[in-house]
């Protein structure tokens, strides 16, 4: 029986050009985590295999950093990064647990400030 639960950061926001840590935590189970997959809609961002290390998809390689831990750091954020992210925990013997994070990338406060006080 699968007793575990995934705790995530839930809905988060970050500024355009900044970075964010996507983090999930599996609790309430003694199952062994063999791998964590990070996905965005139908796109694979990265895989962290407990034994084999990290794989990062080439389309994200220049702005995704592994960690901390089983998490993922997404850098140089753009508005297009807004959306759902999933952490998929492969465990033994339980099976698969999935967590969801919604990221909203906002225009930076500097940009907003500049727009509000623009000289005509």
């Amino acid at each position: 029986m699968m007793t575990g639960t995934i705790e995530t950061t839930g809905n988060i926001s970050a500024e355009k050009g900044g970075s964010i840590i996507l983090q999930c935590h599996l609790s309430s189970t003694t199952a062994q985590v063999t791998q964590v997959n990070w996905e965005q809609q139908d796109q694979l961002l990265a895989i962290c295999n407990a034994d084999l290390g990290w794989h990062i998809s080439p389309s994200f390689k220049d702005r995704v950093a592994p960690g901390p831990g089983l998490g993922l750091t997404l850098q140089s954020l753009t508005v297009n990064d807004t959306g759902e992210y999933f952490c998929i925990y492969h465990t033994y013997p339980d099976g698969t647990y999935t967590g969801r994070i919604f990221l909203e990338v906002l225009e930076s406060s500097v940009a907003e400030h500049g727009a509000r006080f623009q000289i005509p």
Partner: antibody, heavy 119, light 107 residues
Amino acid sequence: EVQLQQSGPELVKPGASVKISCKTSGSTFTEYTMHWVKQSHGKSLEWIGGLNPNNGGTSYNQRFKDRATLTVDKSSSTAYMELRSLTSEDSAVYYCTRGTYYDYSFAYWGQGTLVTVSA
Amino acid sequence: DIVMTQSHKFMSTSVGDRVSITCKASHYVSTAVAWYQQKPGQSPKLLIYSPSYRYTGVPDRFTGSGSGTDFTFTISSVQAEDLAVYYCHQHYSTPWTFGGGTKLEIK
């Protein structure tokens, strides 16, 4: 240029063991996980397992877990695969292979080691 | 284990033709798929990864596409030197698995 140099062909008797080596040159050995792949004559490829020299972690295909042992010698940048209790089904070419920076795809391959199990 | 099925064991084609090889995964593998070429008597060689990126030095006549469970490898204009066996490979979850291979024969 990255090169994986494997040991030569082996003729072994049923029930015996074999240990194949794979020496890496042209890159930092500890940065990349080394994998082993089996190819029986005229057949497809079968992943045996991989070893991460950085943390010592190993991942095995369950089909080989009881009989295969993957090890490394960091000082000589050499990976080893030992296969025990050999039968004729183990007669095959064995390849060492590894990926590139943060990529699991097998970008580099050894030349293969032919293992023949025969009485 | 995830089974990678290459429906055609053999494909016959002529020089200059366009040929596509398909690979179907028994379970979802996202984009964690690569394609390899193995010529007679040689080690496999990485052509395509993730699953539409050409590896360094691979001619642009080789392309790949797909996501989820269905993947396609295409040679836009077959050359005589493309005579080989082509394998798909998933590394989404262990044990990593390969397709049975498709042998490309030149007419």
